[in-house]
């Protein structure tokens, strides 16, 4: 009779993550009488996958019923596979012995492959924001994918970007793998409403690309510019002098009024307005009553935007000649900024 | 080498359940398959469960099934032991061991490294 053979007949076989891995084995012959073993790996280091005598394999099934006298498909299932379960698997056909049962021939080997999603692609800002004109690095990190080939592009508003650098870890083999992209981006006065995306393509997705996205506005900061101006007399003695702030980002920001150095009013940013841009525009002002100075006047608007040093507007307020009343100033008025007298 | 250390025993009342732990350094825990033995006082070191390196094969001395489950987390390089339905008979130190090879309940004769036990005592 012809010596017993373990035949693989598969030498490769491609399973998704999360799916149930068939591999496949028989025997050509019932003599040696002793029983199957499966293994991952060859050697001495090898692990072992399924005994036939005994354990607990909860992952493990037989296809056919290894208890029939005349069995000989030795085939198991392996479910949930994980990107860990890769490797090749050797079905092996024991010979009782005594005390220990003896090795007596092994299949070909069957290479089990596991391709793995990744995961969905994270994309982390700077800590601190920055104004415009500076370029601010975004990371991308995605984990957990398999085989290893990969593709990263990055986008801002839909238009590729070219300045990043991407690493896969590790360089060698492995169940697993991970993908690391920075990416520098200048920034712009019109970025508030722009988005960084971080796109990842591979095998698994089938064509449907994963994104990571990060809004700008949580990394960029737009400064205030300032205009002060002398508005019209409203009443005898009295001048409105206003202070514009105009297209700051975020929104957080003080404004102090100085007159002649002396601190006269602190304000915080309240009722703002927003530009089509996602700026903000705020304006503040302060009535001078000009009889209770002798001299010419310095009105400084000194603004504290988003924890910056201050940045100031100063105007220079005449008294020597005092203005006519030239009636009320209704778009002053309306502006909801607290008013209040300086004596 | 490979230095093993066992945490999670105690005393517990009969019936109770508890789970040991087993940390592992000095090598590649995934490379390595563990097990889990006891020694009652006067009595012979004894297989309790085993598990290989990935986790996919378990093995379960015949008193021990059913009431006790031997895992691993190859990213903590930790393998533990849960004990439900303890007796009194459960009484023992219980020893981590790593094997470089597995072959079952041959993991005893297997076995290259050993910790310094933790103690458990079930009371009646």
């Known amino acids: 009779e012809e010596e017993l053979q373990v035949i693989q007949p598969d030498k490769s076989v491609l399973v998704a993550a999360g799916e149930t891995a068939t591999l496949r084995c028989t025997a050509t012959s019932l003599i040696p009488v002793g029983p199957i073993q499966w293994f991952r790996g060859a050697g001495p280091g090898r692990e072992l996958i399924y005994n036939q005598k005994e354990g607990h394999f909860p992952r493990v099934t037989t296809v056919s019923d290894l208890t029939k006298r005349n069995n000989m498909d030795f085939s198991i299932r392996i479910g949930n596979i994980t990107p860990a379960d890769a490797g090749t698997y050797y079905c092996v056909k024991f010979r009782k012995g005594s005390p220990d049962d003896v090795e007596f021939k092994s299949g070909a080997g069957t290479e089990l492959s596991v391709r793995a999603k990744p995961s969905a692609p994270v994309v982390s800002g700077p800590a601190a924001r920055a104004t415009p004109q500076h370029t601010v690095s975004f990371t991308c990190e995605s984990h957990g994918f398999s085989p290893r080939d990969i593709t990263l592009k990055w986008f801002k508003n839909g238009n590729e970007l070219s300045d990043f650098q991407t690493n896969v870890d590790p360089v060698g083999e492995s169940v697993s793998y991970s993908i690391h992209s920075t990416a520098k981006v200048v920034l712009t006065r019109e970025d508030v409403h722009s988005q960084v995306i971080c796109e990842v393509a591979h095998v698994t997705l089938q064509g449907d690309p994963l994104r990571g996205t990060a809004n700008l506005s949580e990394t960029i900061r737009v400064p205030p510019t300032l205009e002060v101006t002398q508005q019209p007399v409203r009443a005898e003695n009295q001048v409105n002098v206003t202070c514009q702030v105009r297209k700051f980002y975020p929104q957080r920001l003080q404004l102090t009024w100085l007159e002649n150095g002396n601190v006269s009013r602190t304000e915080t940013a309240s009722t703002v307005t927003e530009n089509k841009d996602g700026t903000y525009n705020w304006m503040s002002w302060l009535l001078v009553n000009v009889s209770a100075h002798r001299d010419d006047v310095k009105l400084t608007c000194q603004v504290e935007h988003d924890g910056q040093p201050a940045v100031s507007k100063s105007h220079d307020l005449k008294v020597s000649a005092h203005p006519k009343e030239q009636g009320s100033n209704t778009a002053a008025e309306n502006t909801g900024s607290n008013e209040r007298n300086i004596y | 080498q490979v230095q093993l250390q066992e945490s999670g025993g105690g005393v517990v009342q009969a019936g109770d359940s508890l789970r040991l732990s087993c940390v592992a350094s000095?090598?590649?825990?995934?490379?390595?398959?563990m097990g889990w033995f006891r020694q009652a006082p006067g009595k012979e070191r004894e297989f309790v469960a085993g598990?290989?390196?990935?986790?996919?094969?378990?093995y379960y001395a015949d008193s021990m099934k059913g009431r006790f489950t031997i895992s691993r987390d190859n990213a903590k390089n930790l393998v533990y032991l849960q004990m439900n339905s303890l007796r009194p008979e459960d009484t023992a130190v219980y020893y981590c061991a790593a094997a470089l090879t597995f072959r079952g309940s041959d993991l005893p004769r297997d076995s290259n490294y050993w910790g310094q036990g933790t103690q458990v005592t079930v009371s009646s």
């Open positions: 598990i290989s390196r990935s986790g996919i094969s378990q």
């Open positions: 000095g090598r590649t825990f995934s490379s390595l398959d």
